[in-house]
Every structure is written in C-alpha cells, then in structure tokens.
Interface confidence: low
C-alpha cells in the first residue's frame, strides 16, 4: 500500500480541503472510525487500484486516525494497512468528544489505563488533574492517545490553554471494583442423581442485604420454569440463600446450573455454576489401572489402593483366596473405604508387617443395587536376598571349589568376583568378575530351586578354580529387586594353610 502524503502524522489547516490517496495491487479503501467515508475508487490501466479521500472544509472534529486497507482480505497479510493521524488545529474545538463509555473506566486490578482526552493541535500543552485539584499530575501524554499510566479511584480532567482561555475536558471516572464485595457460593445436595430423584441446589450470598438471584438451568431453556425459594439464614447476618428444587429429575435435567447474583447499589455482580448429572441408573466404575501382579516386601507394611467412582454409595468387600477379609484384631490387616468426593471412593487394604503367608490372590468387590465391579490381583511377597552360605573346599582332583547359597524373592542373580592383590583389594583395585564361559581358569555351575512353602527362591552356585597359586579373595554377591548381599572368602593354594 502506498499512501500520499505518507504521514504518519499530518497537521492541516481548519476550513481547508485536503486530498488523501491510497493505492495498492488490490482494491483499497479508506476507513475512519470503523466506517468508510465517501471516496473515489479507481483502477488504473496498469492494474493498480486507488482510492481518493477528499477532506473538505476541515474542522477540529476531523482530527483522528485514518486507515487505508485492502477492500477484502483474500490472501493478504495483516500488515497491509497504513495508518495516518491527522490534526486539524481548531480553536473552536477544545477536547475531542468522547463516547459515554470512554468516560467511565472500570478496573479490577492495578493495571495501566489510558485517559483518552485528545486535542486538535499537537502543539498544545495538555495537563492532567484530579477533578478537584489544580496540581498537574506527572503522567506522560500522547497527543494521539491521551494520558497513560496507573491511576487511583478518582475523577480526572484534562486541561489545556487555547489562545488565552483555559479549556477543561469532560471528567473521566476511574473505578477500581472490589470483586470481593459480592461473594456467591453454590452447592448441591448431590451433583449426581438417578432419574426420579430430586435435585436441590443452594446459592448463598454473604455480606449483602439487597440482592437479586437469577438461576439458569437446562429445564429453563425448554421453557419449563422452576420457582426458586429465597430465605435469610437467621443465625448468620447477611447470609441470603436461594434454593432451587427440582423434584423427580429427568435425564434432560443434566447440565450446568448457574446462580447469578446482582447487587444493585454498586451494580456489582457475581455468579457461580455447578454441573448436575442425571443418570439412568446407578454405576460403579474403576478409575485407573491396578496391575494383576502386586508386590509387597517382607516385614514392611504395604497398602493396596483401588480408586473408583460410584453412585449411589456402594458396599465394598475384600477377599483373599476367595475368603472374605475383615479388620483383624491382631492389627495385621486394616481395611478402609474413603469417600474422597461426592462420587469418588478410595478403598485401601493395608497389610501391617507383611508375612510370607499373606501372598496370594486378592479381590476387591464394590456393588450396589444397580451395578458392581471387581478387581483382582496376585500379591507377591518380595524377600530381600541373603547369602546363606559361602564355602571353600579342596576336592582330591586338585581343583578348588567355592559354593555360594542364598535365598530371596524375586529370584536372585549371582555375581562372582575375585581379587588377587589382597593388600590393595577392594579399595584400590576393582575385583575381577569370574565365571565367564571364556575364562578357562574357572567354571561355574548354578542351580535354582523354588520353595513353595516359604515362597522364595534358593540359588546354589559352585565356582571351580583350576589353578590357585597365591591367596585369592573370592566374593559372592546376590542381588534382587529388593536388595543385595555380599560375602567373601579367601582361597589359598593347597600348600598354604587354609584360612577364611
């Protein structure tokens, strides 16, 4: 877009005539105050479009913004817009007129605002004052916008001197609204009801004597009005309550219920909404997933938690291996089901100082007259590994063997390592791993057994050493998901005294 003259700011004489031209590769139009003033549009032979805006008999009221923009927005970028600001200094016009809405500036927090008092002459000195004060306020002024800054709750006027007369603007009123001046709370006896049950909502306002309640609700939109009841809570001053009661709810009554409260003295208002769900019948739904295999550590306490939604409130039972569980008098098992919100529940089974015998198949069942759900899982008791035995022997064959035996759940892994420089092991030298198949000096044989009664694995591993020519530190490390244990022996050549 090409604008002639280019601006961006022009100062024109009062009563004069002035021509603004805008041209572009697509149809263009001049805009003034969101409207299109009369203008001449043309298309040149070279395909250029233009619009000529002739401003005749200019007055101060012609002061303001002029925009040239494309007549349509097909594929054109938003920056294809030229802004021009025209001043027409006019001693007969003081401050440019404002819409009524511009005189009242409402705020709900501390933020920068603009008091939009504008003059026709960019040379004029404009000052800002409190309505009842003569002192000019130190606020920056933009002749095209007004005074911008952070203002208190006051009335303000702008002043300027035109010739030898002082001119005042209209008063601007800045209101900082106290949102807390009206405080609405909405609650429902139940936000989930079955069809045929009642919906009862209460809207309470604190700290006001005269308020107007307005409810919006799904039934209202279909023209079926319900008359709310308003009462005063006598035990609490200035607590006013509106009750909306819908007997025998239908599925169509599901939706948002909004209580709008207006207080006419200061014209404050607030509103709160609540969602009501009407269900055809009750339900029980599991939330989240509980794995089919759960773990607990021996002698530690473990809480197993199931989260679900239900309406109406359900009965909850726990079973182990198909036998009903209850709180044990010895305090070994604790059962609890908590209502964490209107329809959400958390049921917990706590095993105190878990024993091996508590491994097994657990089921939680939640049910009421309309629905039921059950969740099952296997509980495995994890037992930290411990090395039960690490022994060294000298068979007649001449080789030396080291046997390591340990237990744990889940199945332990075994790691053999050795260190030849006893003075520097293990602080300075890392031990050498043993038992790799490529290692000819040692052979490894490992057996694993599962002990049903104890519900744990036993690992027995035998390390055969072919040539021991000097003392050797041999270490057996057992490791599983809940711990590790290490033991160590010294293996010495046949000719040396044996020592552990």
């Amino acid at each position: 877009l090409v604008v002639t003259p280019p601006g961006p700011e022009l100062v024109l004489n009062v009563s004069s005539t002035f021509v603004l031209t805008c041209s572009g590769s697509a149809p263009v139009v001049w805009e003034r105050m969101s409207q299109e003033p009369p203008q001449e549009m043309a298309k040149a032979q070279d395909g250029t479009f233009s619009s000529v805006l002739t401003l005749t008999n200019l007055t101060g009221l012609d002061t303001g913004e002029y925009f040239c923009t494309h007549n349509d927005s097909r594929g054109l970028e938003t920056d294809e817009r030229k802004r021009l600001y025209i001043f027409v200094p006019d001693p007969t016009v003081g401050f440019l007129p404002n819409d009524a809405e511009e005189l009242f500036i409402f705020l709900t927090e501390i933020t920068e605002i603009t008091i939009p008092c504008r003059v026709t002459d960019p040379q004029l000195v404009v000052t800002l004052h409190e309505k009842k004060g003569d002192v000019a306020l130190p606020v920056p002024y933009d002749h095209q916008r007004g005074f911008s800054g952070i203002f208190e709750d006051r009335s303000y006027i702008c002043k300027t001197t035109i010739g030898d007369r002082e001119v005042d603007s209209d008063a601007y009123y800045v209101y900082r609204l106290q949102v807390s001046s009206i405080n609405v709370s909405v609650n429902a006896v139940q936000t989930v009801v079955r069809q045929g049950e009642n919906i009862t909502l209460m809207c309470i306002v604190i700290g006001n004597e005269v308020v107007n309640f307005e409810w919006t609700y799904p039934r209202k939109e279909s023209g079926r009005l319900v008359e709310p009841v308003t009462d005063f809570l006598l035990d609490m001053p200035y607590h006013i309550r509106s009750i909306l009661h819908i007997p025998s709810a239908e599925l169509e009554d599901s939706g948002t219920y909004t209580c709008n409260v207006t207080e006419s003295v200061n014209d404050h208002q607030d509103e709160k909404a609540i969602n009501i769900t009407v269900v055809e019948s009750g339900y029980v739904r599991l939330l989240g997933e509980v794995g089919t295999l759960q773990f607990a550590e021996l002698h530690r306490s473990r809480t197993l938690q199931v989260v679900f939604e239900a309406y109406p409130p359900p009965t909850v039972l726990w079973f182990k291996d198909n036998r009903t569980l209850g709180d044990s008098s010895a305090g070994e098992i604790a059962l609890s089901t908590r209502n964490v919100s209107e329809t959400r529940y958390v049921s917990e089974l706590t095993l105190v100082r878990v024993k091996v015998a508590e491994a097994g198949h657990y089921t939680m069942r939640a049910f009421h007259e309309d629905a039921e759900v059950q969740l099952s899982f296997q509980l495995q008791i994890n037992v930290p590994v411990r090395v039960l035995e690490l022994s060294e022997s000298h068979p007649d064959s001449g080789e030396q063997t080291v046997r390591c035996r340990g237990r744990g759940m889940p199945q332990p892994n075994i790691i053999w390592s050795a260190c030849r420089d006893l003075k520097r092991c293990p602080r300075e030298l890392p031990p050498t791993l043993l038992g790799n198949s490529s290692e000819e000096e040692s052979q490894l044989e490992t057996n694993v057994t599962y002990w049903e009664e104890e519900q744990e694995f036993e690992v027995v591993s035998t390390l055969r050493l072919q040539h021991v020519d000097r003392p050797l530190s041999v270490r057996c490390t057992l490791r599983n998901a809940v711990g590790q244990d290490t033991q160590e022996v010294i293996v010495v050549p046949h000719s040396l005294p044996f020592k552990v």
Partner: nanobody
Framework: EVQLVESGGGLVQAGGSLRLSCAAS????????MGWFRQAPGKEREFVAI????????YYADSVKGRFTISRDNAKNTVYLQMDSLKPEDTAVYYC?????????????????????WGQGTQVTVSS
C-alpha cells in the same frame, strides 16, 4: 486464580468452519476486553480480533475481516470466535486473552503487551 481455557480447535478442510470458545474463571468477566491472537509455527503471535467490555463493539485483523466473528456471553463468562471460510494460512495455535485496560482506539488492542491474562491455546489446522 485466573484461568482462560480455550476449546473447539481441530482439523478442518479449507472452506470449512470452526467455533472456538474461551471460558474465563477467576476474573470479573464483563469488565474485560476479550481478544483472540494466533501463532503459526516459526512466526510471531498476531492479533485476530477483539470484543470490547462495554457496548460489545468488535475489531478484526484485515486478514480475517468478513470471515471471522467474535462474540461474548457475559452470563457464561465465555468469548467465542466463529471462523468461516477457513484457509490453510489460518493454521495456528489460537490464544484467548483478557485486557482490563480501556483504550479509545481499538487498534491499541492489537498489541499483546496490553493483555493481562492469556490462555494456553488451542490448535487449529486447516488442510487444503
């Protein structure tokens, strides 16, 4: 805590329509000018439209004028952006914003620094 939550975005073919909503909570809605901005990948955030707090007057970026319509429902604390005749170049994340300041010139609201609160955005994708 003030929250602006946009919804209604999605994938639409060129020429199609979408309606974005922005639900406001924690602020005194009727005293905020509500705007929509958008940001395409690798580009700066740009102004789309604004609706004033009083009088409900509206203002649009040239690129959307005649195709997009901004409206508000003070009773529901919600501002809407009806987007018709969508084009591939309308693909962007659309943000809702609230400005409590008052400016006589709507063009002021094309500046993002004039807004107090912003939503997290909703993706609009227009395929050709």
């Amino acid at each position: 805590e003030v929250q602006l939550v946009e919804s209604g975005g999605g994938l639409v073919q060129a020429g199609g329509s979408l309606r974005l909503s922005c639900a406001a909570s924690g602020l005194f809605f009727s005293f905020y000018n509500m705007g929509w901005f958008r940001q395409a990948p690798g580009k700066e955030r740009e102004f789309v439209a604004i609706i004033r707090k009083t009088g409900g007057s509206t203002y649009y970026a040239d690129s959307v004028k005649g195709r997009f319509t901004i409206s508000r429902d003070n009773a529901k604390n919600t501002v809407y952006l009806q987007m018709d005749s969508l084009k591939p170049e309308d693909t962007a994340v659309y943000y809702c914003a609230a400005a409590s300041s008052y400016y006589s010139d709507s063009y002021y609201y094309t500046r993002s620094d004039k807004y107090n609160y912003w939503g997290q955005g909703t993706q609009v994708t227009v395929s050709s």
